[in-house]
């Protein structure tokens, strides 16, 4: 079927970066400036995305791939393919409808984006707070009481997967 289709449809021979031009007897024509086709057999080329205003160009448009945008400093991407730019706040703040607001007491945000989250409640696990939380970071809980008993082993357990830089950086 594929072979038959290609015999019947000359457009299937048009590679990425071209389109099948009905106005020119279905020959493969290069995509015009500021347009692209990322797959073969296209009957039109797509208009390149333009990174304007708060968006800036991360990757230029080519005849075979669309431009990619990111956000100017002070903003970060949201949505698939960076469809929106949202204002950064400082660590210890969150973005509200009225702008950046400090985290309420008992909450923290260690990033320039996202919302303030509650400090960990160490006492839920029977642990104490060794270092208080701040607006910018969570508390440090003590170890479990079992770790501190006279018979406790000092052997280091195997490391779980830790996020790079959680803020252990």
């Amino acid at each position: 079927f594929e072979r038959t289709r290609s015999l019947q449809d000359p457009c299937s021979n048009c590679p990425a970066g071209t389109f099948c031009d009905n106005n020119r007897n279905q020959i493969c024509s290069p995509c015009p400036p500021n347009s692209f086709s990322s797959a073969g057999g296209q009957r039109t080329c797509d208009i390149c995305r333009q990174c304007k205003g708060v968006f800036r160009t991360r990757k230029e448009c080519s005849s075979t791939s669309n431009a990619e945008c990111d956000c100017t400093p002070g903003f970060h991407c949201l949505g698939a393919g960076c469809s929106m730019c949202e204002q950064d706040c400082k660590q210890g703040q969150e973005l509200t409808k009225k702008g950046c607001k400090d985290c309420c007491f008992g909450t923290f945000n260690d990033q320039k984006r996202g919302i303030c989250r509650p400090w960990t409640n160490c006492s839920l696990d029977g642990k104490s707070v060794l270092v208080n939380g701040t607006k910018e970071r969570d508390v440090v809980c003590g170890p479990s009481p079992a770790d501190l008993s006279p018979g406790a082993s000092s052997v280091t357990p195997p490391a779980p997967a830790r996020e790079p830089g959680h803020s252990p950086q």
């Epitope: 260690d110 400090w119 960990t120 696990d125 642990k127 060794l130 270092v131 208080n132 939380g133 701040t134 910018e136 970071r137 969570d138 508390v139 440090v140 809980c141 170890p143 479990s144 770790d147 280091t156 357990p157 490391a159 779980p160 830790r162 830089g165 959680h166 803020s167 252990p168 950086q169």
Partner: nanobody
Framework: QVQLQESGGGLVQAGGSLRLSCAAS?????MGWWRQAPGKQREFVAI???????NLADSVKGRFTISSDNAKNTWFLQMNSLKPEDTAVYYC???????????WGQGTQVTVSS
Amino acid sequence: QVQLQESGGGLVQAGGSLRLSCAASGSFNAMGWWRQAPGKQREFVAIITRDGSTNLADSVKGRFTISSDNAKNTWFLQMNSLKPEDTAVYYCSASDYGSSLYYWGQGTQVTVSS
């Protein structure tokens, strides 16, 4: 596997000083020191966070200081005016903000003679 290695323990006379070091194979946000005397529970000595916040047990305040070299994943316990009751095995610990997981070194013996 995370490795923590203490060094600097030893025998010292009362009133003397020692400096303990702990080197970690990874990066952590909360680095501490604990001690355990024979037959007793392991007790908190000092802790420092990556941003420099510190907390020391009341029994060592004014005598011990904790510091760190974040770039080298190493932290230190400077112990001055040592007393016989400071005799114990000293363990370094590593954890993260909000984490219930602790990593421990193997311990280094500190003995203070009178």
